[in-house]
């Protein structure tokens, strides 16, 4: 049960061609399913059935992005066409360098995520809930650029560096 | 680190009253912060959150009732209009810094009695 | 609306006996489950997370299982300074909450 520490950073443009950065930090927690490691990348938010489509070449996105997907409720999909791991290996396949799972409406995600997997992914699986996946998907549903840091953990407060 | 509740006292009912958690050790930047109520003999209320001095939550009973606010080393809570039922000890928690959403690090708590 | 029902309300044990606490959520928290012990007239203090990992310096006759919708919180060999009211929490939602918390347990030591 190792702790993801989630650093979103959202970038708004002005009018003037300028960027203004909004950084959220967000906790959540890394699955057996994938890699307890760091990764980072812009986000690209996922619709479940999305990746369902088998056919790779149609939305394969650069190489490094992070996937976000909002499960729903099972009674929503009672016959899903992938198994959550199964959707966390498919973002993969497709350049995903981590997978973060917003869990809230399926917690029963949490275990399919956690089985012990005799071949996890080599790139991590996150699961938020709560305030943090809505903290999460507000950023999101913004359609705006936004970049997620994955981290095992939590990023320094600026009174932590020390002056050498 | 610590936390430590003030503000606590007497008041008729209908009177503002304002509630502050003092903490220190740790920046408020980096930890969620929850109010819990005790009336007395009763169990444990949640009253709500507040996540990082912008994001707020509250139990359904205690929306409009209550307001909770943060500066940079405190964290406020108003009861808008209290009533008797509102008498209790009042405390303020740390959440914990992972997902588990266990409040961690208590205050002693501040007692609030309304009556007229 | 995630709702916690705690069982019994009250219980009575021998000292070096074993009490067992029952906390139910009206729906699937997962894991996300805490207990803590409440002695009166002192702030409420974190004994389990996650259902079963025991928080920092809390003695291993504290022990925690459960997920889903049931947990159960037990305490093996109490002693005298068990005595007191044990909570549990949910830590799944924050929103369209009435209260995180169950209604408390009080553990009587005789």
């Known amino acids: 049960k190792e702790t993801a520490f989630v650093e979103v950073v959202l970038f708004e443009s002005s009018p003037s061609g300028d960027y203004t950065t909004y950084t959220t930090g967000l906790t959540g927690r890394f699955s057996r399913a994938g890699a307890t490691l760091s990764a980072e990348g812009e986000i690209v938010q996922m619709h479940p059935l999305g990746l369902c489509n088998n056919n790779d070449e149609e939305d394969l996105y650069e190489y490094g992005w992070v996937g976000v997907v909002k499960l729903e409720q099972p009674e929503l999909d009672p016959k899903p066409c992938l198994t959550v791991l199964g959707k966390a290996k498919r973002a993969v396949q497709r350049g995903a360098t981590a997978v973060i799972f917003d869990v809230s409406e399926n917690p029963e995600a949490i275990d399919q995520l956690n089985q012990g997997s005799e071949d996890p992914l080599k790139r991590p699986v996150v699961y938020v809930k709560g305030a943090d996946a809505i903290k999460l998907m507000n950023i999101v549903n913004k359609q705006k650029v936004a970049r997620a840091r994955i981290q095992h953990r939590p990023p320094r407060q600026p009174t932590e560096y020390f002056d050498m | 680190q610590s936390v430590e509740e003030s503000g606590g006292r007497l008041v008729t009912p209908g009177t503002p009253l304002t509630l502050t958690c003092t903490v220190s050790?740790?920046?408020?930047?980096?930890?969620?912060m929850g109010w819990v109520r005790q009336a007395p003999g009763k169990g444990l209320e949640w009253i709500g959150i507040?996540?990082?001095?912008?994001t707020t939550y509250y139990a359904s009973w205690a929306k409009g009732r209550f307001t909770i606010s943060e500066t940079s080393t405190t964290v406020d809570l108003k009861i808008t209009s209290p009533t008797t039922e509102d008498t209790a000890t009042y405390f303020c928690?740390?959440?914990?810094?992972?997902?588990?959403?266990?409040?961690?690090?208590w205050g002693p708590g501040t007692l609030v009695t309304v009556s007229s | 609306a995630y709702d916690m029902t705690q069982t019994p309300a009250s219980v009575e044990v021998a000292v070096g006996g074993t009490v067992t606490i029952k906390c139910q959520a009206s729906?699937?928290?997962?894991?996300?489950l805490n207990w803590y012990q409440q002695k009166r007239g002192q702030p409420p203090k974190l004994l389990i997370y996650d259902a079963s990992t025991l928080a920092s310096g809390v003695p291993s006759r504290f022990s925690g299982s459960g997920s889903g919708t049931e947990f159960t919180l037990t305490i093996s060999g109490v002693q005298c300074d068990d005595a007191a009211t044990y909570y549990c929490q949910q830590g799944w939602s924050s929103t369209n909450i009435d209260n995180i918390f169950g209604g408390g347990t009080e553990v009587v030591v005789k």
């Open positions: 507040i996540y990082a001095g912008d």
């Open positions: 050790g740790f920046s408020l930047s980096s930890y969620a």
């Open positions: 928690a740390r959440k914990s810094d992972d997902d588990s959403d266990s409040y961690l690090l």
């Open positions: 729906q699937s928290i997962s894991s996300y």
